[in-house]
Each structure stands twice: as structure tokens, then as C-alpha cells.
């Protein structure tokens, strides 16, 4: 054995998205001597770990290791042994960390640098984890599905059918949606980017794009629900709240403490006289929509046009990919259908929230009922957000393409995130100079 | 031919340091995880950890027992794996070898001569 | 930490003999399980990898089978240089770990 066994002719990559309310662990794969081709890197495995998000195990970081341990030991089944010290390991943390490290920096370290330690005792060429920006995640994920849609390539694509096929290079936009924040990214229409922070420059094969991104902490599902509860027990006349984007009937009891355990509800935090309230749900779509509206601040715009609380967001522009929670939400309510109009999404999910929670239950008895619960409100919070929130109209939202994967690799930042950090996207045609990453930090 | 040379054994008291060497030659050095083991007299194998390359940071992992008192480190211009050994006991009276694994991982397919520590008052 | 557990300590054969070493591993390893031969003031020589791989100038009568929890190395026939001390070797998971050691002896 005195000969280093002869690397395979693909290369693989490991990416762990360290999101808010869980961790996947996605397994890439590309031919070795195509590595600056555009569309030849391929998801070849998806892992989700069981258990929270890793801004949870604050108070328990000794359980990281075993936490990771499943998916860890997945991956090196999946790649063959003789790859696994070449194959690069990254861990990016979003929103849920980016929270934390709000709280407290040091709370943030500890989780990060457990995970740190935890994922270098496996083979691989492990680079690091760390808490990646809400600009990051946005441009990441543009990148992903434009590479995957064949949008940066000049010469025919390497799969047979494209899907959204546009018949031209124009890119698709982004939109994002998490547990704790929500990113929305496209190229606008010869628009100046008023707002610097929002403005991304990038140059891929030879081109040359200017991109808006911008990322709403606090505004994924599972935040804005508690945004949402935090808002609206403050005018509750008693531990009693009555809530339209709960099934009828549907029960149950949250902790004040809970409510205010994250940043994302200071904003509405008072002293209230009682330590636990119990929501009960009465199913009213338009009630819920208006709602979820007194969470944008639509008030106050320093820019030609905002999208809410502040935010310039120039003219919506093209196609648009609508993935991660956008896309399960709207798959589970069987609402992804190109054909589907949001007028009749709106009377859909009308129709949804108003079924009784009893019904539901048995409708979907094999769904968690702890999810079940929530996708009347994250259904329209979706509608919410994209007509309301970044001003889809219902002649636009056929321009709304709900995607979970594309030729069998996940819409997410994770690809994107990993192309750049192993220099996989030139910035010229092959064979020239690869980006750096730091034209993204 | 590939070759693992250890040196820097020797007679130690308790609570001292000691810095071992390992020169390699014949293979890549810089390509490859380098690891430690000893061997306490008429006993078994004991595995004392590992340094990983440029790429993974120089990324070391040790065992509990030596954990906090020895210090991995190489020198790839050099072709030498280091191991620098301090507040040492009695029970870290071994043979030291310098090992590797030219094909694949975590097991041993190179070996050094060994070279003995004794650490004795 | 993984334990490998090795029976007999020791084993008694003659030449010609067929030799079954064991090792147990506290939890699965799947086949990260390395075997090793090792003769008094030399350094171990590596035998098998991965439970059943053999290695080239190493002679074939030397096999090794397993995985999971339960290995085994065996000798075919017994020649006069194999009598030495083998050692087994967890290389699923850090801290890598070895057995204890069986020592084959001429009977």
C-alpha cells in the first residue's frame, strides 16, 4: 500500500446548512476535469439530522457531536473511501445562529466552535463552520439556481430538459424563505441599487451582473409566527388568544417566556400578567392576512420604493425561484402548480384555514402535528410577503416559480456557497481566473 | 525507498519535557497525516494522536492521556514531524513511533524504528 | 472511545496449524478494523486492512474477515516467522484505538 490509491475521476463536497430549526448535510458531486464547466456539479445526497437547529444546543453543547453523528457517518458511506480526505467539508450557519450571536456573542462561539471540533474528528478536509451573512445566503442562492438553470452557460447545457425554460440567459430571481429570516435576490432592469448595503457585483463566465439582495432577519416563518403571537397578545384581554391563522378548535398553550426568549419579539415585549397564554385557533384566512400586514412597516420609505421596514427593493424584474420554506409550504398545500393563479391560491387557502382542526388532523394524520398546525399561517404569510411585502401583483405571480430541487440538486444557498469556495465559478470562460470569496464577504 | 527516522529519546525526569523527531523521506511528506504511537514496555500499542495538512489547518487530535501536555507539529520545508512532550510521568515510558498511511486513513502502513523515552527520577 | 477486545491473550499452535484470532469492538466499526503483526525490538507491520483487504508482499495465507463488532484474523497454516504478537485496530473513529494484543506462541 505505498502508492496513494488512485483518486476517482469525480470529486465530491460536503456542505451542512446550519438553519434555524434544523441542520441537512448536502453531498455534491463533479467530474474532476470539468470543474469550471458550468451545470456539471450535481447534489448526489441530502441528510437532514434529527433534532433542532444548532442555535439550540446553546445550553448543551456537549450533545453536538452525537447530534452530527448520523448524517457525518451518511457521508462517508456515500463517498468512497479513498475521497474522503480530499473532499472538502463546510458548515454555514444562518439565521437561527445569527440570532443567537445577537444575544450573545460568546453563546455563539461556544455552539460554533463545538460543531468546529465535532465535524474535524471525521476524514475529510473539514474548512470550518461559521455564521454566514443574510447577503451571503441571498447571492448564494441566486447563484445555485442560475447554475443549476443553465443561466451562466454560453453552450448547450449538459442535462436534455431545462424546467422554467425562459429560452434565453436572462437569470432567474431568488426568493428564499427560512425558519428566521427570508432573502429576496434578482438582477433589476437597468435600476440603480440605491442602497449600497443591498448591492452585489459579480463577474461569472465572462459577464457581468449587478444584483440586489437583501435579507429580512426575523422574517422567516417560524420568526415572524412569533412576531405575529408577541404582537397580538399585547392587546389580549386575558390569557385567551383568539387567532385567525389557526384552525377551528385547534388548542394550545405557549409560555410567555418562550414568546420572549427571542430578539425578534423585543419589539412587542410587555409585562404581561400571566406566565402562559393559550392560543385558540378560529380559521379566518383575511383576519390572519391582516394580521401578518402589521408586521411590515410600510410606512417609511427613504428610497424611490421599499419593500417594508425601511428597505429599498427596486422594481421586480423576470422569473423568479421560490425555494426552501416558499416551496415546501406551498408543495404541501399543493399550491406550486405553474397554472395556479394567486387569485385562486387566495381562495384556496381561505378554504384551508376555515377546515376545522379536527378535520385536518385526520386529513393528514401522518403529518407532525406540531407543522400541521402552523401551515395556515405560513401559507399566508407566504402570500403576505410576496404580494405585500415585495409587491407581486397578481399579473406578476405567474413569474413566481415555486422550485424544491432542479435536475435533482435543492434550491438553496448550499451549492452556491460551495461552488465559490472551491473556486468552481470563473469569473471568465473557462479556463481563466476563478472568483475569489471575497468578492462576496 | 520510503523511510520514517525517529530521534530525541532519552532519559527524563518527571514533570519534564522532551521533543521527539521523525524525518521522512521517499514520499510526499507534505501530502500526508502524520501520526504518533508508543509502546510502554511489555505492553501494547497506544495510539497518541495525529497532525493533518497545510489544507486542513494543521488540524491535531490527541489522546486523553496525553491530552493538554504533548504538542504535535511538522515542518513539510523539512520533511519532519514533531512531537514535543511535556510535563511527563512515569507512564509515558515507551517506545515512540513515527507512523503514516500512504493509502487511505487511520491505519498504519509506515512505521519508524522507535525511539525510547524514559521518564524516571 | 471505541474498545477493541482481543481473545485468546494468548495461543498456542504448532507449525502447519491453522491460527483464528479475534477482536471485538464495543460498538459497530463497520469494517474500519485493521490487523497488524508485531516480533520482540521491531516495530508492527501492517497485515490487513479494512477487516479483509491483504497487502501486497504480505503472503496469503493471512485472511481477514469481519464487520460490525466481530473480526477475525486467521493463518491457514502456521510457518516459524509467524509466531509473534497481533494486534487489531479501530480506524472507524478518533481516538483510533488498539486491542490488547494476542500472542501466538509455539506449542
Known amino acids: 500500500t505505498q502508492n496513494k490509491a488512485l483518486p476517482e475521476n469525480v470529486k465530491y463536497g460536503i456542505v451542512l446548512d446550519a438553519g434555524s430549526s434544523h441542520t441537512s448535510l448536502y453531498i455534491y458531486k463533479w467530474p474532476a476535469e470539468k470543474e469550471n464547466d458550468t451545470g456539471v456539479v450535481h447534489q448526489v445526497e441530502e441528510c437532514r439530522v434529527k433534532g433542532p437547529g444548532i442555535s439550540k444546543f446553546v445550553q448543551k453543547v456537549n450533545e453536538i457531536g452525537i447530534y452530527l453523528t448520523d448524517c457525518m457517518e451518511r457521508a462517508r458511506e456515500v463517498i468512497p473511501r479513498s475521497q474522503h480526505q480530499e473532499t472538502p467539508v463546510y458548515l454555514g450557519a444562518t439565521a437561527g445562529m445569527r440570532l443567537l450571536r445577537m444575544e450573545s456573542e460568546e453563546l455563539a462561539d461556544r455552539v460554533l466552535d463545538v460543531v468546529e471540533r465535532s465535524l474535524s474528528n471525521y476524514p475529510f478536509d473539514f474548512q470550518g463552520a461559521r455564521i454566514i451573512t443574510g447577503q451571503e445566503e441571498g447571492a448564494y442562492g441566486w447563484i445555485t439556481i442560475n447554475y443549476l438553470l443553465g443561466k451562466f452557460s454560453q453552450k448547450t447545457r449538459w442535462f436534455s430538459i431545462v424546467p422554467y425554460e425562459t429560452n434565453n440567459q436572462e437569470t432567474f430571481g431568488a426568493l428564499d424563505l427560512g425558519g428566521a429570516s427570508t432573502q429576496v435576490t434578482f438582477v433589476p432592469q437597468n435600476q440603480t441599487i440605491e442602497s449600497p448595503d443591498n448591492a452585489l457585483q459579480f463577474r461569472l463566465y465572462g459577464k457581468d451582473y449587478n444584483v440586489y439582495t437583501h435579507s429580512f432577519l426575523c422574517y422567516g416563518k417560524d420568526q415572524a409566527l412569533w412576531q405575529k403571537l408577541a404582537k397580538d397578545i399585547q392587546v389580549a384581554s386575558n390569557e385567551i388568544l383568539r387567532d385567525p391563522c389557526f384552525h377551528p378548535g385547534y388548542k394550545k398553550v405557549v409560555n410567555v417566556s418562550d414568546l420572549y426568549k427571542t430578539p425578534c419579539t423585543k419589539r412587542f415585549e410587555m409585562t404581561l400578567p400571566f406566565q402562559q397564554f393559550e392560543i385558540q385557533g378560529i380559521g379566518n384566512y383575511q383576519q390572519c392576512h391582516q394580521s401578518i400586514l402589521e408586521l411590515f412597516n410600510t410606512s417609511y420609505c427613504p428610497y424611490s420604493q421599499c419593500a417594508f421596514n425601511g428597505i429599498f427593493l427596486p422594481p421586480l424584474q423576470g422569473d423568479f425561484g421560490a425555494f426552501s420554506a416558499f416551496y415546501f409550504v406551498m408543495k404541501f398545500l399543493n399550491l406550486t402548480s405553474e397554472k395556479v393563479s394567486q387569485e385562486k391560491v387566495t381562495e384556496m387557502m381561505k378554504k384551508f384555514c376555515a377546515q376545522p382542526w379536527e378535520e385536518i388532523k385526520t386529513s393528514y394524520a401522518g403529518v407532525k402535528e406540531k407543522y400541521l398546525s402552523e401551515y395556515c399561517f405560513s401559507g399566508t404569510y407566504i402570500l403576505s410577503l410576496l404580494l405585500q411585502g415585495y409587491h407581486f401583483t397578481a399579473d406578476s405571480w405567474e413569474h413566481i416559480h415555486f422550485i424544491g430541487k432542479i435536475q435533482g440538486s435543492d434550491a438553496g444557498w448550499t451549492l452556491g456557497y460551495m461552488l465559490n469556495l472551491t473556486n468552481m465559478i470563473p469569473a471568465e470562460q473557462p479556463l481563466s481566473t476563478p472568483l475569489s470569496h471575497s468578492t462576496y464577504v | 525507498e520510503v523511510q520514517l527516522v525517529e530521534s530525541g529519546g532519552g532519559l527524563v525526569k518527571p514533570g519534564g519535557s522532551l521533543r521527539l523527531s521523525c524525518a521522512a523521506s521517499g514520499f510526499t511528506f507534505s501530502k500526508y497525516w502524520m501520526n504518533w504511537v508508543r509502546q510502554a514496555p511489555g505492553k501494547g500499542l497506544e495510539w497518541v494522536g495525529e497532525i493533518r495538512l497545510k489544507s486542513n489547518k494543521y488540524g491535531t487530535h490527541y489522546a486523553e492521556s496525553v491530552k493538554g501536555r504533548f504538542t504535535i507539529s511538522r515542518d513539510d520545508s523539512k520533511n519532519t514531524l514533531y512531537l514535543q512532550m511535556n510535563s511527563l510521568k512515569t507512564e509515558d515510558t515507551a517506545v515512540y513511533y513515527c507512523?503514516?498511511?500512504?493509502?487511505?486513513?487511520?491505519?498504519?502502513?509506515?512505521w519508524g524504528q522507535g525511539t525510547t523515552v524514559t521518564v524516571s527520577s | 472511545e471505541i474498545v477493541l477486545t482481543q481473545s485468546p491473550a494468548t495461543l498456542s499452535l504448532s507449525p502447519g496449524e491453522r491460527a483464528t484470532l479475534s477482536c471485538r469492538a464495543s460498538q459497530s466499526i463497520s469494517d474500519y478494523l485493521h490487523w497488524y503483526q508485531q516480533k520482540p525490538g521491531q516495530a508492527p507491520r501492517l497485515l490487513i486492512y479494512?477487516?479483509?483487504q491483504s497487502i501486497s508482499g504480505i503472503p496469503a495465507r493471512f485472511s481477514g474477515s469481519g464487520s460490525g463488532t466481530d473480526f477475525t484474523l486467521t493463518i491457514s497454516s502456521l510457518e516459524p516467522e509467524d509466531f509473534a504478537v497481533y494486534y487489531c485496530q479501530n480506524g472507524h473513529s478518533l481516538p483510533l484505538t488498539f486491542g490488547g494484543g494476542t500472542k501466538l506462541e509455539i506449542k
Open positions: 507512523t503514516t498511511q500512504l493509502d487511505l486513513y487511520w491505519f498504519f502502513d509506515v
Open positions: 479494512y477487516a479483509s
